[in-house]
Interface confidence: medium
């Protein structure tokens, strides 16, 4: 089943997010991902925890998952590198790098996204864009076309309140508001983009979606710059 958590969003402009990837298992969408280099897609480590007996591939240049599109191409995966400290059952270090079988063919609809290297929190209230093919309602309806939503960043202190995530949000994580608009199941591994720069990756715990007291949790990529660079080197 797809992992992660977009509720309350709308259909994205086709191919306006050329960095967007669909991580697929046995030909079906599993998680989001983001092209960070010609041959590398960043996603969430949890996405692979149940994929051991399946074929993992990455779809780039897509808006619709099912319809033919000139820019769409499915890539095999050469190497899957989860963060070495990731655990299947915690949200910490929930990052995965997938090396494509070959360099992606770049164009208007396929382009890597610059990612944040300066390890500094995004200012609370900043509007950031999250996109994905995750479920769009509580009944579990999955969209065929890419959805997106703008979400304000939530300060860590509020996110860590006992009524919210009760101290689980470390300095390597960030939160975004989740009042009816939220990332949801199937969006895990997808990008949180602030000012045209990748700031976060949707984590893939089993959080309820669209509840303002359970904000969306995102892994801060700047906190993992050294690891990302070491794998891509």
């Amino acid at each position: 089943p797809p992992r992660g958590r977009i509720l309350g969003g709308r259909e994205a402009e086709a191919h306006a997010r050329p960095y967007m990837a669909s991580v697929q298992l046995n030909g079906a969408h599993l998680c989001g991902g983001v092209l960070v280099a010609e041959q590398w897609v960043l996603s969430a480590a949890h996405c692979l925890e149940d994929a051991a007996d399946g074929k993992v591939q990455v779809l780039l240049g897509a808006h619709s998952l099912s319809q033919p599109e000139p820019s769409k191409r499915l890539y095999d995966v050469l190497r899957a590198v989860p963060h070495p400290d990731s655990q299947p059952d915690t949200i910490d270090h929930d990052l995965l790098l997938l090396q494509l079988s070959e360099k992606a063919t770049l164009g208007p609809a396929v382009r890597p996204l610059p990612w944040q290297r300066v390890d500094r929190d995004v200012a609370p209230g900043t509007l950031c864009d999250v996109a994905g093919w995750g479920i769009v309602n509580h009944a579990g309806r999955r969209p065929d076309s890419l959805q997106h939503v703008l979400l304000p960043v939530l300060d860590r202190a509020t996110c860590n309140r006992r009524t919210h995530h009760d101290g689980a949000i470390t300095e390597r994580l960030m939160c975004a508001e989740s009042n009816r608009r939220d990332s949801c199941k199937g969006d895990s591994g997808g990008p949180l983009v602030c000012g045209g720069v990748l700031e976060g990756v949707v984590t893939s715990g089993s959080r309820v979606c669209g509840n303002r007291k359970k904000p969306g949790i995102y892994t801060r990529v700047a906190s993992y710059a050294a690891w990302i660079d070491s794998v891509l080197a």
């Epitope: 480590a45 993992v56 899957a80 590198v81 990731s86 915690t90 090396q99 089993s206």
Partner: antibody, heavy 121, light 111 residues
Framework: EVQLVESGGGLLQPKGSLKLSCAAS????????MNWVRQAPGKGLEWVAR??????????YYADSVKDRFTISRDDSQSMFYLEMNNLKTEDTAMYYC????????????WGQGTSVTVSS | DIVLTQSPASLAVSLGQRATISCRAS??????????MQWYQQKPGQPPKLLIN???NVESGVPARFSGSGSGTDFSLNIHPVEEDDIAMYFC?????????FGGGTKLEIK
């Protein structure tokens, strides 16, 4: 320091039942998957069962040799882990180890000292 | 099930020499660039101890004389130089597919 302490082993007759326990300490128990692995006297190791955490809906997995007879469970509030064994057979005689696994590659990194189960008529 | 065949079943090595234990899998244990193969050491009356994960990663606290190599279906554990403390049974184990399986074991003795 990670510690796993098994208990509940004993001598019983075929078709009998037994419940093994494992007390865990020294790590955040509720975020780890746990396993039972057994070793018959003078023999090799055999993986028996695995249970994942709450965030993975406590998914369970069993070896074919124990399926429908053994049940794995856990109590996160007590950091306890269990193996309920029914319809025991002589070939279930073994040392039973409680084992933690870590990471996406399912590495069994910490093992308890084991508890002995003997099934004999 | 993936069957792991270890060889030799027993091995006698002089102190200071090299011991090599092999493990062959009935099918590949590769998972997108990582070999899901572990090695354990078990001394009499003790539980197994993890030595090496993912074919070649030596666990923290394990002496540098232990090393692992291999990919696909063929793997080996090397101990060099062998010390008295290394007398034990050694097992390989795959975590590529459930059920996870172990090799039959290799008994290391000192000549």
């Amino acid at each position: 320091e990670v510690q796993l302490v098994e208990s509940g082993g004993g001598l019983l007759q075929p078709k009998g039942s037994l419940k093994l326990s494992c007390a865990a300490s020294g790590f955040t128990f509720n975020t780890y998957a746990m396993n039972w692995v057994r070793q018959a006297p003078g023999k090799g190791l055999e993986w028996v069962a695995r249970i994942r955490s709450k965030s993975s809906n406590y998914a369970t997995y069993y070896a074919d040799s124990v399926k429908d007879r053994f049940t794995i469970s856990r109590d996160d509030s007590q950091s306890m882990f269990y193996l309920e064994m029914n319809n025991l057979k002589t070939e279930d005689t073994a040392m039973y180890y409680c084992v933690r696994d870590r990471g996406y590659y399912y590495v069994m990194d910490y093992w308890g000292q084991g508890t002995s189960v003997t099934v004999s008529s | 099930d993936i069957v792991l065949t270890q060889s030799p079943a027993s091995l006698a090595v002089s102190l200071g020499q090299r011991a090599t234990i092999s493990c062959r899998a009935s099918e590949s244990v590769e998972y997108y660039g990582t070999s899901l193969m572990q090695w354990y050491q078990q001394k009499p009356g003790q539980p197994p101890k993890l030595l090496i994960n993912a074919a070649s990663n030596v666990e923290s606290g394990v002496p540098a004389r232990f090393s692992g190599s291999g990919s696909g279906t063929d793997f080996s554990l090397n101990i060099h130089p062998v010390e008295e403390d290394d007398i034990a049974m050694y097992f390989c184990q795959q975590s590529r597919k459930v059920p996870w399986t172990f090799g039959g074991g290799t008994k290391l003795e000192i000549k």
